[in-house]
């Protein structure tokens, strides 16, 4: 039960309070008390529960009623069973008692009032009327957790609006408020109990801007509501009227967590005692509500697609058509950003990252942009916010990024266990330097520290500076799996292409083509290839990076070797020692439910079948899955990107709740 | 055959900032290594910075690392040096050059550790 | 003072050959076969005329050859003609933090 306030009571004359429902009330019997009195009895009206403790306990007078000796080891404490229908009409009376002197007694008067702030901390979508309880000013997590949920509104409803939602302090319709969180005030007073108290709500300064909150007026419309707390306004005096009432706040997220805000927001209403006007207002009662804001959730492979965006760039008809085809297969909307919109600038994966946020009423979309702000740069803003899905962006708007900042360099995990430690929504993954030096590129510092502060999706660093363009989704990528852990972790592996090409040779074809039906390029023989000492030796420093990383996986995401895969794939060493594949990447693949779309990687054909392509499918086709191998070679891979680069995804959100995890 | 065209300078005090574009024509400049290199009246070659055909990677001279910043817009076909603090040693012609990074080449060819096309440069003078 | 050393001044008569020396370290010359050679005329922009120790661009004539020993690369001029009079200078890869190397450069007289 929630603290209340200190009574004192004197013989002198009556004392009047107020007794908020729910909450334990002190009362000081004892520092007023008539100096040669040594004991005290208590009587109260029925509404009235009077508590006393006293060690050792107290004699039973042969009247029936109980006294106790006045000193400080008496603790008398007292709630009320229902609201006052008027002013102090709930009545203790404190008789003091001494060897020589006939009772003397101390009147209280009280006032029984019911006032809760009220909101969804049970997390079941709906919001249950919730007396002053201790419990509603801490969050939890977990199953068994409790607290209320915050979204971001971060979408833009209004499609007029270049905006989002929560750059204003106005709400445009029902759909704007259902972005919201309802938070009820419920008030039962005396009619005359506002005439001498007041009601404020506020929010702690260092929240004041991550928030705001608007007041329902007179039924729940929209264009009925008006901001009562937000970035200028930290308080906001209510007019309350006197007897039963609820009151509706709808309050809205204007950040995501982050370093400097851990995500939580507190929502206060004080009760004021305002009766002696000649006399500062004092403090009387409190009542909270924790709000947690919802984190921003990246999706992995392993979730179902809704949704494929891709560029259409000068002469890539044949490569649209391709994941045209793959999305119709997979049964996904697909979105196709035209010339005039992408400025030539092709690589959808790399400017933004779908994922999702949500509270217990409702999920919403939420494009994370990176800020390598190149072509694209107006596509997420401009294309993917809108009516309910959301828009988010950290790090430098005008240079400072490096190639690292690209989200091609940023993929999740499927959910993993590792121990005892459960991440029901897997793990975040980016690509680093090994280790900083003048010349090493790393994701920039507020995406990482954005991407940590989510809580739910514990990054993991990854090695990724050694290749040319320094993403992650080079070297590895995530397939579902119907055994198993449900998945299967792809990594590029220069060891099996050298192992698959010594056997096509020992099998005599030595002489058969990488690279055949490419105008304009080198066709390699595979005896040409396997005798390349440099190539070799390249290949031999790349096997040893990406052996890094499936070391630093195995441990980070309780992975065994079983669950990983190795796709056969050469790199070459360019300049700056930086590395990039030789033939088509085929790690860097499109992945839509059971359907896969690869990067053709032109390998030597054998049989009238690519070898590479075979052993591909031998890997993945025992898993469910289809293969379909496309034509990327020179609209994207000469450009040092492939498929996936290519694409982007929006992914259905995971059945699990976030807040029933423990990060 | 790629053909640069170097813009920006000027006299500015020390201290100050200016920035020098090296506009392509005749090729697509996305498809190229771009270098700075800079010499001061009477003086040798000095490599400044570099940028990768793949707008992904960044090199500097320790001379200029943290003051310069190199750039590219594929889109107009140009490369950028942003120099800010700048020094009275900063004084120089500051040449555009390039290499085209040939995806054709089984192994390192160095493309980018040399400059096959350069530009006519552009006088930056510091001085107060 | 540069961070690969040239002779300040070579000279040579026309028809004959003349060779201008580039040392450096292991950690460049040494190490890395990306040395390049560049002629420079009075008021000119430079001119590639050697990449990867002994490469030559299309266009430039066969009397230009590069060659590497340890850590010195060298460039050789046979069959001097009067338009070779120019400052040469070389380049290397580095594996400091200055990536890119330039020699101090030569002025070759054709006398």
């Known amino acids: 039960m929630a603290q209340g306030t200190l009574i004192r009571v004197t013989p002198e004359q009556p004392t009047h309070a107020v007794c908020v429902l729910g909450t334990l009330t002190q009362l000081d019997v004892c520092s007023s008390a008539p100096e040669d009195c040594t004991s005290f009895s208590v009587n109260t009206s029925p509404g009235v529960v009077v508590d006393i403790a006293h060690s050792p306990p107290a004699k039973k007078k042969s009247t029936g009623s109980s006294t106790w000796p006045l000193d400080p080891g008496v603790e008398v404490t007292l709630t009320m069973k229902a609201a006052s229908g008027s002013t102090g009409d709930q009545k203790v009376q404190i008789s003091y008692h001494g060897p020589k002197t006939p009772p003397v007694k101390a009147l209280l008067y009280l006032t029984g009032v019911e006032i809760s702030l009220s909101a969804d901390i049970t997390r079941t979508g709906k919001v249950k009327p919730t007396r002053a309880v201790e419990d509603k000013r801490t969050w939890t997590w977990g199953p068994c957790g409790q607290g209320a949920i915050l979204l971001v509104n971060c979408d833009r409803d209004n499609p007029e609006s270049s905006a989002m939602d929560c750059e204003d302090d106005e709400v445009l319709d029902s759909k704007d408020l259902k972005d919201m969180s309802l938070m009820t005030l419920s008030t039962k007073t005396p009619q005359d109990f506002f005439t001498r108290h007041t009601l404020v709500l506020h929010v702690a300064r260092s929240e004041m801007d991550k928030v705001r909150v608007f007041q329902a007026t007179r039924g729940r419309l929209s264009s009925r509501c008006r901001v009562v707390l937000g970035p200028k306004q930290p308080s906001h005096y209510l007019m309350v009227p006197g007897g039963k009432h609820n009151m509706d706040f709808y309050v809205e997220a204007l950040a995501f967590p982050d370093t400097n805000f851990p995500g939580l927001i507190t929502l206060t209403v004080s009760m004021l005692d305002t009766s002696k006007l000649e006399l500062p207002e004092a403090v009387v009662f409190q009542d909270s509500v924790v709000f947690r804001v919802a984190p921003w959730i990246m999706t992995p492979n392993t979730q179902p697609p809704q949704e494929v965006y891709v560029c259409s760039i000068f002469e890539n008809e044949d490569f649209l058509k391709s994941v045209t085809a793959l999305a119709m297969q997979a049964r996904c909307k697909l979105t196709i950003c035209p010339e005039e919109e992408n400025m030539d600038d092709q690589w959808m994966q790399d400017e933004m990252e779908i994922g999702y946020i949500q509270a217990p009423h409702k999920t919403l979309p939420v494009v994370f942009d990176s800020p390598r702000n190149r072509g694209l740069k107006e596509f997420p803003i401009k294309r993917v916010m809108g009516p309910d899905f959301g828009y988010v962006t950290r790090g430098p708007q005008t240079g400072g990024v490096s190639g690292l900042d690209s989200f091609g360099n940023l993929e999740v995990s499927p959910p993993v266990t590792v121990g005892d430690k459960e991440y029901p929504l897997g793990r975040i993954l980016f690509g680093d330097s090994c280790y900083p030096s003048s010349d090493s590129r790393e994701m920039h510092q507020a995406l990482q520290d954005f991407l940590s502060a989510q809580q739910v999706q514990a990054p993991v660093k990854l090695y990724s500076d050694w290749l040319t363009v320094g993403h992650v989704d080079e070297f590895l990528s995530f397939v579902p799996a119907p055994d198993r852990k449900g998945f299967r972790l792809l990594l590029a592996s220069p060891r099996s292409c050298y192992k698959l090409f010594q056997e096509q040779q020992n099998e005599g074809h030595g002489d058969a083509l990488l690279f055949q039906g490419i105008k304009k390029k080198n066709q390699q023989k595979i005896k040409n290839i396997l005798s390349n000492t440099t190539l070799r030796e390249h290949n031999s420093f790349v096997e040893r990076c990406i052996d890094w990383n499936r070391e630093l996986l195995k441990r980070e995401l309780g992975l065994a070797e079983s669950d990983i895969i190795d796709i056969p794939q050469l790199f070459k060493l360019k300049e700056f020692s930086k590395a990039e594949a030789f033939f088509p990447n085929m790690v860097n693949m499109l992945v839509l439910g059971k359907h896969l779309g690869i990067p053709k990687p032109f390998g030597p054909i054998i049989n009238g079948r690519c070898c590479l392509e075979e052993k591909v499918c031998s890997l993945l086709e025992p898993l469910g899955l289809h293969c379909t191998f496309i034509n990327d070679f020179y609209t994207y891979h000469i450009r040092h990107g492939e498929v996936h680069c290519g694409t982007n995804v929006r992914r259905k959100p995971f059945s699990f709740k976030w807040w029933n995890m423990v990060p | 055959q790629v053909q640069l065209v170097e813009s920006g300078g000027g006299l500015v005090k020390p201290g100050g900032s200016l920035r020098l574009s090296c506009a392509a024509s005749?090729?697509?400049?996305?498809?190229?290594?771009v270098s700075w290199i800079r010499q001061a009246p009477g003086k040798g070659l000095e490599w400044v910075s570099f940028?990768?055909?793949?707008?992904?990677?960044?090199y500097y001279a320790d001379s200029v690392r943290g003051r310069f910043t190199i750039s590219r817009d594929n889109a107009k076909n140009s490369v950028y040096l942003q120099m800010n603090s700048l020094r009275a040693e900063d004084t120089a012609v500051y040449y555009c050059?390039?290499?085209?990074?040939?995806?054709?080449?089984?192994?390192?060819?160095?493309?980018?550790?040399?400059?096959?096309?350069w530009g006519r440069g552009t006088l930056v003078t510091v001085s107060s | 003072q540069s961070a690969l050393t040239q002779p300040r001044s070579v000279s040579g008569s026309p028809g004959q050959s003349v060779t201008i020396s580039c040392t450096g370290t292991?950690?460049?010359?040494?190490?890395?076969?990306?040395v390049s050679w560049y002629q420079q005329h009075p008021g000119k922009a430079p001119k590639l005329i050697i990449y990867n120790v002994y490469e030559r661009p299309s266009g430039v004539p066969d009397r230009f050859s590069g060659s590497k020993s340890g850590n010195t690369a060298s460039l050789t001029i046979s069959g001097l003609q009067a338009e070779d009079e120019a400052d040469y200078y070389c380049s290397s890869h580095s594996r400091s933090s200055t990536p890119v190397l330039f020699g101090g450069g030569t002025k070759l007289t054709v006398l």
């Open positions: 050059s390039s290499a085209n990074d040939d995806v054709d080449d089984i192994v390192a060819p160095g493309r980018g550790y040399y400059m096959d096309v």
């Open positions: 005749g090729s697509t400049l996305s498809d190229y290594f």
């Open positions: 292991s950690g460049d010359v040494g190490r890395y076969n990306h």
């Open positions: 940028i990768s055909s793949a707008n992904t990677f960044t």
